[in-house]
């Protein structure tokens, strides 16, 4: 964590990416502890900000405004040196979000990927952003930054993520910034959950009363496994949304979830996946596909009695 011998380490919590109106703590770690320190904002020519005040342990900034965006450094107290202060710390960039319209975020080929694959996350906007930033929820590192490419009145950037492993699964958001205000970011894009499959053994998927049913007959799909999955996810080919249910332990020592599909009106191919509460975005191998056929008079769609999850929210715990 520490820099050189006489260099403090400046960090921010909970994040270096802070929304307008949020609060952030700047901590200056120096010589195996938190000492008195001074803060500098680089666009103020290294003049101590906050009227030369001296802070202990941390300084809380907020509610933050666009003016708080920028590069900060600190100097730790060193009473016996010539100046009384250490060398400047590492630069710490604080980015303030919520200053422009949100961009859009898409995953190519899609948000559900196998371990080892690569995904392209494309951030785009009709606002002429100079830079795009990609941030994964829950990590304290600075967001990835790319220069926007402008084409046909749209600015965009393609972030390549991979080869995919569990640590890269999660909820992503992107932001844009305009020229001359590189750290005053837009509102965040809608969240996009990147799910990695193929890490655990596949569950089995069955249909009650069976995979071939009469139109109007009630159908339930059961996903089960000997593995102690916390959650099961059911997807239907051609549908963007998945459904999820908490797994229930059964007397035969399997873990099962029963998805009621309601009265059968339309067939389809279904798959299910298992996941654990601790890693909600890391899923098992897919079950074998199950083709549900409806005989009689199928209509154009199957009602959804269980509420489908939105395009995001997969990577949240199911409470």
């Amino acid at each position: 964590l520490m820099g050189g011998q006489d260099k403090p380490f400046l960090s921010a919590r909970p994040s270096t990416v802070v929304p307008r109106g949020g609060h952030v703590a700047l901590q200056c770690h120096y010589r195996r502890g938190f000492n008195n320190f001074m803060l500098y904002k680089e666009d103020r020519s290294h003049v101590p900000i906050f009227h030369g005040r001296i802070f202990q342990e941390s300084f809380i900034m907020g509610p933050v405004t666009p003016a708080h965006a920028g590069t900060y450094r600190c100097r730790g107290s060193r009473p016996h040196s010539l100046t009384g202060w250490s060398a400047p710390s590492n630069p710490l960039v604080i980015m303030v979000t919520g200053n422009h319209r949100k961009p859009s975020l898409l995953a190519h080929p899609g948000p559900l990927l196998k371990s080892g694959e690569t995904v392209i996350l494309q951030c785009w906007s009709d606002v002429m952003f100079e830079h795009f930033f990609l941030h994964r929820e829950g990590i304290s590192e600075d967001p990835s930054r790319l220069v926007g490419q402008i084409h046909d009145g749209v600015s965009k950037a393609n972030f390549s993520i991979g080869p995919l492993m569990p640590v890269l699964a999660g909820t992503y958001r992107c932001y844009g910034s305009v020229p001359h205000s590189p750290y005053q970011l837009s509102a965040p894009s809608d969240p996009l959950d990147i799910v990695i499959t193929g890490l655990y053994e596949k569950p089995s998927l069955s249909a009650q009363p069976g995979p071939t049913v009469q139109a109007g007959e009630n159908v339930t799909l059961s996903c089960s496994s000997w593995s102690s999955y916390d959650i099961y996810h059911l997807s239907r080919e051609g549908e963007a949304h998945e459904r999820r249910l908490r797994a229930v332990p059964k007397v035969n020592r399997t873990f099962q979830a029963d998805f009621p599909l309601g009265p059968a009106t339309h067939g389809g191919t279904y798959r299910c996946f298992g996941s654990f509460r601790a890693l909600p975005c890391v899923w098992s191998n897919s079950s074998d596909p199950l083709l549900v056929s409806v005989t009689g008079n199928p209509s154009s769609s199957w009602p959804s009695p269980t509420e489908p999850s939105s395009k995001s929210g997969i990577c949240r715990h199911l409470h």
């Epitope: 994040s15 802070v18 109106g21 949020g22 609060h23 809380i60 929820e137 829950g138 969240p191």
Partner: antibody, heavy 120, light 107 residues
Framework: QVQLVQSGAELARPGASVKVSCKAS????????MHWVRQAPGQGLEWIGY????????ENNRKFKDKTTLTADKSTSTAYMELSSLRSEDTAVYYC?????????????WGQGTTVTVSS | DIQMTQSPSSLSASVGDRVTITCRAS??????LAWYQQKQGKAPQLLVY???NLADGVPSRFSGSGSGTQYTLTINSLQPEDFATYYC?????????FGGGTKLEIK
């Protein structure tokens, strides 16, 4: 002790403006941001916006951007919220509230509320 | 903007009961959450800040828990003075939105 005392109830005609005041005492006025919250009859709470009395910086909820103007007078430790172009749906209780200090601060002190009634 | 979904919207309970009110944020709010109690015709009063910290003078039967997007206010052994409306509010960026409120009534 910290106190936020708001001005009295207002009855206004549609299209008129009113200015609600919030006088702070018991703390350094310029060291805390002052926020305004609205509660329509029988409804929940809505954050309107805030002012930093030290710098004059204001930020508004987009919903109220053209409706409210926030100001502060450091010499009297008073925050003001002006409501303009009043309509019947602006009838509500308006509260001022102080945002506390710390990394995770709440609204630690509230005014008693000012009822604004818009009626012809 | 961050949405705060509070549930239930109303709740009937008896003196001595234990009740739980939940608040879900549309994104991670890093524990930037407060709970308030409001009685009829009065200003809200702070109960819990930073998701888990009890405000000064608040009885210990009140407690807050949660992190990320999911937060809970629990009242152990309800007292007659606890029947009121409760609101959560996030502070992770403006607008600082409130939950829709939970009206706690005597059964």
């Amino acid at each position: 002790q910290v106190q936020l005392v708001q001005s009295g109830a207002e009855l206004a005609r549609p299209g008129a403006s009113v200015k609600v005041s919030c006088k702070a005492s018991g703390y350094t006025f310029t060291s805390y941001t002052m926020h305004w919250v609205r509660q329509a009859p029988g409804q929940g709470l809505e954050w309107i916006g805030y002012i930093n009395p030290s710098s004059g910086y204001t930020e508004n909820n987009r919903k109220f951007k053209d409706k409210t103007t926030l100001t502060a007078d450091k010499s009297t430790s008073t925050a003001y919220m002006e409501l303009s172009s009043l309509r019947s749906e602006d009838t509500a209780v308006y509260y001022c509230a102080r945002l506390g200090k710390g990394l995770l601060p709440p609204f630690d002190y509230w005014g008693q509320g000012t009822t604004v009634t818009v009626s012809s | 903007d961050i949405q705060m979904t509070q549930s239930p919207s109303s709740l009937s309970a008896s003196v001595g009961d234990r009740v739980t009110i939940t608040c879900r944020a549309s994104e991670n709010i890093y524990s930037n959450l407060a709970w308030y109690q409001q009685k009829q015709g009065k200003a809200p009063q702070l109960l819990v800040y930073a998701a888990t910290n009890l405000a000064d003078g608040v009885p210990s039967r009140f407690s807050g828990s949660g992190s990320g997007t999911q937060y809970t206010l629990t009242i152990n052994s309800l007292q007659p003075e606890d029947f009121a409306t409760y609101y959560c509010q996030h502070f992770w960026g403006t607008p600082y939105t409130f939950g829709g409120g939970t009206k706690l009534e005597i059964k």
